[in-house]
């Protein structure tokens, strides 16, 4: 069964900067990745970035840079410049649309006790649905 993992990492040098790492574990090719915060995409979350293998990437503040790390994983850099939600208490969700598997989504957040530079374990936490 395909799985999605999510890591949220606070940057050691810049305490207002965070990076979300997401990956897809499974066969098939990724057709679209959507990153949201505050909840799943389409279920109360706010779309932060979309990444497409051919069409490119888009991100919305406070997201600063979305990029592919591998063919099945992405990263999203965020900068907390007084936006309406503090990252430390926020859930980030990644949804991978894959052919022929469909859509798979998981969420993660920064552990409350995280030191700068440490990240949440890359444990897949499947939520809600696999479309």
């Amino acid at each position: 069964t395909p799985e999605v993992w999510v890591q949220v990492q606070m940057e050691a040098t810049e305490l207002s900067s965070f990076t979300v790492h997401c990956g897809f574990l499974g066969p098939g090719s990724i057709s679209l990745v959507t990153v949201s915060w505050g909840g799943p995409d389409g279920a109360g979350g706010t779309k932060l970035a979309v990444l497409h293998p051919e069409l490119g990437t888009r991100q919305w503040a406070p997201a600063r840079q979305a990029r592919w790390e591998t063919q099945s994983s992405i990263s999203l850099a965020l900068e907390d410049s007084g936006a309406s939600s503090p990252f430390a208490n926020t859930t980030f969700c990644c949804k991978f649309a894959s052919f022929p598997e469909g859509s798979w989504e998981s969420c993660g957040s920064l552990p409350p006790s995280s030191d700068p530079g440490l990240s949440a374990p890359p444990t897949p936490v499947p939520i809600l649905r696999a479309d």
């Epitope: 505050g38 389409g42 109360g44 779309k47 979309v50 919305w60 503040a61 309406s84």
Partner: antibody, heavy 119, light 106 residues
Amino acid sequence: QVQLQQSGPELVKPGASVKISCRSSGYTFTDYYINWVKQRPGQGLEWIGWIFPGSDYTYYNEKFKGKATLTVDKSSTTAYMLLSSLTSEDSAVYFCARDGGLRGPFDYWGQGTTLTVSS
Amino acid sequence: DIQMTQSPSSLSASLGGKVTITCKASQDINKYIAWYQQKPGKGPRLLIHYTSTLQPGIPSRFSGSGSGRNSSFSISNLEPEDIATYYCLQYDNLHTFGGGTKLEIK
């Protein structure tokens, strides 16, 4: 087809407030950011801010913080912009525009709402 | 905030000719620039996004290029319906429009 339909022209007095609407149709309203843009007569375009209807998340151009308040009503797929403490500087055409994401920013626009502030 | 300097502010060209408009950003905008056409009394119309990607239904007479801080937009084989004001927009970091270029036909 995608359409954004804005409310009609407004004539208001200085110091008052006005609420402009922008009704969306032809797409999933909660999936796309709605932006608002100001255009003074004979002048260029100024981005005011955005709202993400799926979560009510807003982000404002610093210049318009305290002047504009963006809201949505999901049930009617309508975005609103409240402009307060109006002065003659607020007289302009205001546009709503959908952000198409990977299809491009501001890919569909409303027809514009003319606001005249005069005593 | 990123500033966008668009030039020229106006230009006049002949039917069948070619015009080029430039926009310079105050910092690198990573190709996140779009171009719009606006006719009097109407809302803007998206022509090009991500520097050079033509919107569906837009004629190939319209084109865009650039990298880093510098972007350009061209119209070739000018037609009467191209009379309009053209704006660039950076969307790398929030949104900033250029000042506009009013195109007239000689």
